[in-house]
Interface confidence: low
């Protein structure tokens, strides 16, 4: 229904702390320049005036679209044009043209130093001083370097960061209670921020209908038991709360995915049985959890998949009369029969059974035409198995730092043109896969490793918009996102680059490596690997073994030496020479 | 192999009541949740109601809502329909099924509301 005042209404649905979080969150995913403080107080300003709507919606202004309040505040930013550049363009732009302006200048690769977290004790008393603006600069940080994080989850985040300081700050020992927990939240929070961007992606370069297809999927694997009407109504309601989301529309989004959550909640007889322990959890936590709800049992009697969709003599017919509906329900049928295949695949598959269906009922014979459908699926299905099958064999002999390298290389041979910093940050990515899904059962290994894979691709896609380099990358991130990995894991190595040059300088290292963190120093050592392929794009594995281990040695022994300066000046040229040696 | 049979049905006068069974066997029918769906003649299925698996959370199609309950016996393996007031445009065959799907392959039992 329509309200008199919108931001009155919004402010009345999510209430005052998670309606001041959500437009924090807005500001900070559209301005990532901007301090917390001067964010803080455009949040303040926009809550106050929520307040005079709220107590009487006819006040001035208070009629005015959420956009228009948002970007006037953005827009009478100080100096916008001084920090921001060619995005105050925006600002002479009517909306909904404004919006759209903010949207498309949302950089994904903020040049913002990393986020450090504080020691333990300073973490704690900065909390304890002030939880609020402790969270509000979680909010800020995380929202500023990732300007699609899916808003009512960064709260979600949020409110878990906060139970944990406020236990761990408890304790005796802090940092052993802090550092695993938080860890953790970072881990999942990190994963949620690629999905959610490839989400987006879907939405922006292929529409709704494109996003739907893969909720349709999604759900139906989830919910076997829900009939088809059911898995269209909630494809429908979760397209429009990504799409808001995507869209910068944060109150609306999490509003309606409130919703979504109480609908869920208040229909878990004709949804599913696994409901009921998210549905008796407070809001937040009770979205998340329905968000990665565990599989409903299958039905136990679906008839084969052929019996409507290549046995019926009406295919042709059903096909024609309502296109999107039939392919809407083979795509269900087929998904809450298959919970152990990843959405790509199952969206491929869809694909490939329209594209059958287009030739073949335009032929004589349909019937004999598409008789040999599901046959055809087979490689379709065998590629992304072989894939899993291979990674993780790969994974599980290497363990997670030397199945990255093993990445690193193939990746830096597919595309050497692409920056070192992008190549390594992909490859870590990609090789946390190993850890995250080769450990799960064999039915869900394949979902977990592919739909993640695609969402990391999806980040490199964008990276390399940016500043494209590579035409085999422009190749694999130009087509449809289904198709993106197996385009990528088809690369080989690049025949038209121009090796570089070997410079020292590259492989020249120096004692402030031995006294950085574990994960640092791992960075450093696969970007002189990358810089390696770079060199030699030819290089054996056995070669690149040899220099790496020759690395690791030395920087053992120069880190244990009594004058590491020293050592590092004098063996460090040694090591460049033994390098350029193994790979002549 | 999985079979649902529904008994209970037959002829009965507007404002009066049946009550409805269906026997399952051939899966573990405490892990599921369990609908009655009906279909009149000459109309496609119509969902009616739906149970979870632990019989706990129920729920009903707006034109059946306070007149109908389902409830079920998990060791008897059995879902019930208990119909009161029952109303001419009840007239139809009345299925058990798995979930929430309206296209189970059970016979069905023919209710007839008629004076």
């Known amino acids: 229904e329509a309200h008199k005042s919108e931001i009155a209404h919004r402010y009345n649905d999510l209430g005052e702390q998670h309606f001041k979080g959500l437009v924090l969150i807005a500001f900070s995913q559209y301005l990532q320049k901007c301090s917390y403080d001067e964010h803080a107080k455009l949040v303040q300003e926009v809550t106050d005036f929520a307040k005079t709507c709220v107590a009487d919606e006819s006040a001035a202004n208070c009629d005015k679209s959420l956009h228009t309040l948002f970007g006037d505040k953005l827009c009478a930013i100080p100096n916008l044009r001084e920090n921001y550049g060619e995005l105050a363009d925006c600002c002479t732009k009517q909306e909904p043209e404004r919006n759209e302006c903010f949207l498309q200048h949302k950089d994904d690769n903020p040049s913002l130093p990393p986020f450090e977290r504080p020691e333990a004790e300073a973490m704690c008393t900065s909390f304890k001083e002030n939880p609020t603006t402790f969270m509000g600069h979680y909010l800020h940080e995380v929202a500023r370097r990732h300007p699609y994080f899916y808003a009512p989850e960064l709260l979600y985040y949020a409110e878990q960061y906060n139970e944990i300081l406020t236990q761990c700050c408890a304790e005796a020992d802090k940092e052993s209670c802090l550092t695993p927990k938080l860890d953790g939240v970072k881990e999942k929070a990190l994963v949620s921020s690629v999905r959610q961007r490839m989400k987006c992606s879907s939405m922006q370069k292929f529409g709704e209908r494109a996003f739907k297809a893969w909720a349709v999927a999604r759900l139906s694997q989830t919910f076997p038991n829900a009939d088809f009407a059911e898995i269209t109504k909630l494809a429908t309601d979760l397209t429009k709360v990504n799409k808001e989301c995507c869209h910068g529309d944060l109150l609306e989004c999490a509003d309606d995915r409130a919703e979504l959550a109480k609908y869920m909640c208040e229909n878990q007889a004709t949804i599913s049985s696994k409901l009921q322990t998210c549905c008796d959890k407070p809001l937040l936590k009770k979205a998340h959890c329905l968000s990665e709800v565990e599989h409903d049992t299958m039905p136990a009697d679906l008839p084969a998949i052929a019996a409507d969709f290549v046995e019926d003599q009406e295919v042709c017919k059903n096909y024609a009369e309502a296109k999107d509906v039939f392919l809407g329900t083979f795509l269900y049928e087929y998904s809450r029969r298959h919970p152990d295949y990843s959405v790509s695949l199952l969206l491929r598959l869809a694909k490939k059974y329209e594209a059958t269906l287009e030739k073949c009922c335009a032929e004589a014979n349909p019937p004999a035409c598409y008789g040999t459908v599901l046959a055809e699926f087979q490689p379709l299905v065998e590629e992304p198995k072989n894939l899993v099958k291979t990674n993780c064999d790969l994974y599980e002999k290497l363990g997670e730092y030397g199945f990255q390298n093993a990445i690193l290389v193939r990746y830096t041979q597919k595309a050497p043109q692409v920056s070192t910093p992008t190549l390594v940050e992909a490859a870590r990515n990609l090789g946390r896969v190993g850890t995250k899904c080769c450990t799960l059962p064999e039915d869900q290994r394949l979902p977990c490793v592919e739909d993640y894979l695609s969402a990391i691709l999806n980040r490199v896609c964008l990276l390399h918009e940016k500043t494209p380099v590579s035409e085999h990358v422009t190749k694999c991130c130009s087509g449809s996102l289904v198709e993106r990995r197996p385009c990528f894991s088809a690369l080989t190595v690049d025949e038209t680059y121009v090796p570089k040059e070997f410079k020292a300088e590259t492989f020249t290292f120096h004692s402030d490596i031995c006294t950085l963190p574990e994960k640092e120093k791992q960075i450093k050592k696969q970007t002189a690997l990358a810089e390696l392929v770079k060199h030699k794009p030819k290089a054996t594995a056995e070669q690149l073994k040899t220099v790496m281990d020759d690395f690791a040695q030395f920087l053992d022994t120069c880190c244990k030496a009594a004058d590491k300066d020293t050592c590092f000046s004098t063996e460090g040229p040694n090591l460049v020479t033994r390098c350029k040696d193994a790979l002549a | 192999e999985v079979q649902l049979v529904e008994s209970g049905g037959g002829l009965v006068q507007p404002g009066g009541s049946l009550r409805l069974s269906c026997a399952a066997s051939?899966?573990?029918?405490?892990?599921?949740?369990m609908s009655w769906v009906r279909q009149a003649p000459g109309k496609g299925p119509e969902w009616v109601s739906a149970?979870?698996?632990?019989?706990?959370?129920?729920r009903y199609a707006e034109s059946v809502k306070g007149r109908f309950t389902i409830s079920r016996d998990n060791a008897k393996k059995t879902l019930y329909l208990q119909m009161n007031s029952l109303k001419p445009e009840d007239t139809a065959v009345y299925y058990c099924t798995i979930g929430r799907s309206t296209s189970r392959g059970s016979q069905g039992t023919q209710v007839t509301v008629s004076s």
């Open positions: 149970i979870d698996s632990g019989g706990a959370d129920t």
């Open positions: 051939g899966f573990t029918f405490g892990s599921f949740g």
